[in-house]
Amino acid sequence: AGVFELQIHSFGPGPGPGAPRSPCSARLPCRLFFRVCLKPGLSEEAAESPCALGAALSARGPVYTEQPGAPAPDLPLPDGLLQVPFRDAWPGTFSFIIETWREELGDQIGGPAWSLLARVAGRRRLAAGGPWARDIQRAGAWELRFSYRARCEPPAVGTACTRLCRPRSAPSRCGPGLRPCAPLEDECEAPLVCRAGCSPEHGFCEQPGECRCLEGWTGPLCTVPVSTSSCLSPRGPSSATTGCLVPGPGPCDGNPCANGGSCSETPRSFECTCPRGFYGLRCEVSGVTCADGPCFNGGLCVGGADPDSAYICHCPPGFQGSNCEKRVDRCSLQPCRNGGLCLDLGHALRCRCRAGFAGPRCEHDLDDCAGRACANGGTCVEGGGAHRCSCALGFGGRDCRERADPCAARPCAHGGRCYAHFSGLVCACAPGYMGARCEFPVHPDGASALPAAPPGLRPGDPQRYL
């Protein structure tokens, strides 16, 4: 058992042209909230139960009212983490959907209304117990920045939260058949037995003998479904509901996909993933040949000259599925290394590399100073993926090719005159001042503010600054 945690950092307009209009207005103030849905595995083809790993809704964010004429800023966010408890092992690979919802708070009859602002999705690998992973996803003109992690709930440990640990009862060794829990060598693996009769589908335990219920179930053995709270009431036409959730038929109940197709839910409807030889909304069209043009999105059809022989679609980059019907979010596989930004251009994948890295996948770490000569005795200094030259005295510029004017910065104080010199600069001080930069006044009695003038120099002499 454990918890998947999601921290939303910002939601606002993405970079580039076409900034979205603010979702709120003075007439219709609104606030945001988020929903996360998790499924195990990386495969888009998997016909898992919807949100089989779990789902969570955030709290509502602060109320926001657009300032007239102002561009949409990053919008105020709800406090806290979204937490999705998982009862069994953490799968290590998972798919996510994060939805940004808007709750309008205008004076509609019947209270606030919900609408979906943006939805992002991806597939990731993640070990439980690891550090926070940061991510940026774009949906249209919106950009969502977030971090996530999976952590085990005691007594579970390990990258999959499958091993259970308990403090040792004996100081020397664990009980029969039970191993030490590395790295917690002072703890032992322990069996965990829930309360007798605890529902295996709707209950779980974190301590022996207990029975804790999953959301939607109650009772001592988690066998009683919780009825949803009332959320519809007759308030007159066009009442906007408060966004309550009501139980209903499963979107894929009875599997509407024919011919062995697998069904997955979408918010309004469902989607069928069809086996080879079938296509259509419900995989109902069969006997397909290449002459029927079954390959979408520019896929190349091979074989299938007659209805009894199978055809194969060779999909162009960016598409997959037996009929090339699915767009691949290739960036979700994080192909760009060393923090490079992934751009899926449809026809190709591009990595925009951070400074100091190069290559198709930003895999090459550049030696910043390789082949970069600094002129006039300057030395090359590497740093942060860029090179710079530390120039010898009297030279400046990116490659030390420019002769520096040491007097350009007017270094002589109190009206002193500056002279360039082969070894630096010289200040000729105005009467009454002395020092390398003419910074010290000479006292009227002839004594200077310095403890003693350097030998061989009288006040008023030009001072050479080395």
Epitope: R35, E215, G216, P225, C244, L245, G248, P267, R268
Partner: nanobody
């Protein structure tokens, strides 16, 4: 402005039929999924039928399967619920609403409702 207005409710004997209508304005029903939700006295809400006119997708709760039929006329921007073989346990206020599949939890599928109408009362009694 989004509006949903239900009609067609009334008193009917067990075994009888009714046809409920849901007239929509302010949006195009062909682009949304419309559901009929009912609330019986002392019970929680239940989504009994859904339709997505774009692809003809329909779904029914087990309690009404084979007896209720949901349909839509996109030219009239109206959804319908044909209720046959009515039983006493079908007595409820029926609302139409824009509905979106939200999540699955502990054996239940849950739907978020966007806008709903004012409801129409269906009473099945002898």
């Amino acid at each position: 402005e989004v509006q949903l207005v239900e009609s067609g409710g009334g008193l009917v004997q067990p075994g009888g039929s009714l046809r409920l209508s849901c007239a929509a304005s302010g949006f195009n029903i062909s682009e949304e999924s419309i559901g009929w939700v009912r609330r019986a006295p002392g019970k929680g809400e239940e989504l009994v039928a859904r339709i997505y006119p774009t692809n003809g997708y329909t779904r029914y709760a087990d309690s009404v399967k084979g007896r209720f039929t949901i349909s839509a006329d996109t030219s009239k921007n109206t959804a319908y619920l044909q209720m046959n073989s009515l039983r006493a346990e079908d007595t409820a206020v029926y609302y139409c609403a824009r509905s979106y599949y939200a999540h699955y939890s502990a054996g239940y599928y849950y739907y978020a409702l966007d806008y709903s109408g004012q409801g129409t009362l269906v009473t099945v009694s002898s």
